[in-house]
């Protein structure tokens, strides 16, 4: 399955955080979603191999994501705000 780290993270506002994702082996497409409590998941960014397909919902002044060698991916929030409190979901597909 898709592996993510860390499972939980607590930080103070105005600090930074990063999340790591390892997709299912052989999956070319990787997605990062943000799910705020009581809401559905919102797509932040979609990768096809190394390239970004859609990052229109990603606030580029504080969020960034990269996918190295078309495999692992990192999502950064730098710095975070109170309203960034959410579950960050990684998914992959062929």
């Amino acid at each position: 399955g898709v592996a993510q780290s860390p499972r939980y993270k607590i930080i103070e506002k105005r600090q930074s955080v990063a999340f790591w994702c390892n997709p299912i082996s052989g999956h070319a497409t990787l997605y990062w979603y943000q799910q705020i409590l009581g809401q559905g998941p919102k797509l932040l960014i979609q990768f096809q191999n190394n390239g970004v397909v859609d990052d229109s919902q990603l606030p580029k002044d504080r969020f960034s994501a990269e996918r190295l060698k078309g495999v692992d991916s990192t999502l950064k929030i730098q710095p975070a705000k109170l309203e960034d409190s959410a579950v960050y979901l990684c998914a992959s597909s062929l």
Epitope: S16, P59, K60, D61, R62, K76, Q78, K81
Partner: antibody, heavy 117, light 119 residues
Framework: QVQLKQSGPGLLQPSQSLSITCTVS????????VHWVRQSPGKGLEWLGV???????DYDTAFISRLSISKDNSKSQVFFKLNSLQADDTAIYYC???????????WGQGTTLTVSS | DIVLTQSPASLAVSLGQKATISCKAS???????????LHWYQQKPGQPPKLIYN??????????RFSDSGSQNRSPFGNQLSFTLTIAPVEADDAATYYC?????????FGSGTKLEIK
């Protein structure tokens, strides 16, 4: 192409306020934050504050009581106001665009301020 | 606030030799694993600063003569506190002031700067 153009006065007296407008082109203020940095004569760089893409602001602790930053997304303008000027506020003031992936990648040309009576 | 202490304040290096600039953080500036929120800027007189290292990544178009490495000075939790910018071999165009910057926390903070002179 991406540009940040600053306008503002060059000489002010103590206790007056500095107002600078940073007009941007080539990108949208709804996607990027604009930060303000100053450099005093012969000294280093000092981060002053930021207005984020969502319109919220953060200020350096030392300036929180006399600095305000606002913006007009439709006009692509960011407004910087520093009150109660003193001689040691004499500096070059820069606005700069920041995205996480490129940090401060584009800067304004700088506004040189002298505070003198 | 995170304090960045840069050293030396100035240094003079002969053409073709190595320049080493240090930046020490009062708190860790790594975010996760090896992801760094410590950056290096170069500033020449009359110009705004130019990003040369974004975290541990050399900016596109910047000479590979510039390298960044963290020392082994780490906090008890294994986080990196000391960073070094190395330029080798130094060229005449490298004469400038170099600043480290952290953006792990707001307020962002700069180091005090290191002025590099080429002999």
């Amino acid at each position: 192409q991406v540009q940040l153009k600053q306008s503002g006065p060059g000489l002010l007296q103590p206790s007056q306020s500095l107002s600078i407008t940073c007009t941007v082109s080539g990108f949208s203020l709804t996607n990027y934050g604009v930060h303000w940095v100053r450099q005093s004569p012969g000294k280093g760089l000092e981060w002053l504050g930021v207005i984020w893409s969502d319109g919220s602001t953060d200020y350096d602790t030392a300036f929180i009581s006399r600095l305000s930053i606002s913006k007009d997304n439709s006009k692509s303008q960011v407004f910087f106001k520093l009150n109660s000027l003193q001689a040691d506020d004499t500096a070059i003031y820069y606005c700069a665009r920041r995205a996480v992936v490129a940090d401060f990648d584009y800067w304004g040309q700088g506004t040189t301020l002298t505070v003198s009576s | 606030d995170i304090v960045l202490t840069q050293s030396p304040a100035s240094l003079a290096v002969s053409l073709g030799q190595k320049a080493t600039i240090s930046c020490k953080a009062s708190k860790e500036v790594t975010i996760f694993g090896s992801i760094s929120a410590l950056h290096w800027y170069q500033q020449k007189p009359g110009q705004p600063p130019k990003l040369i290292y974004n975290g541990a990544k050399l900016e596109s178009g910047v000479s590979a003569r510039f390298s960044d490495s963290g020392s082994q000075n780490r906090s008890p939790f294994g986080n990196q506190l000391s960073f070094t910018l190395t330029i080798a071999p130094v060229e005449a165009d490298d004469a400038a002031t170099y600043y480290c910057l952290q953006n792990k926390e707001v307020p962002f903070t700069f180091g005090s700067g290191t002025k590099l002179e080429i002999k």
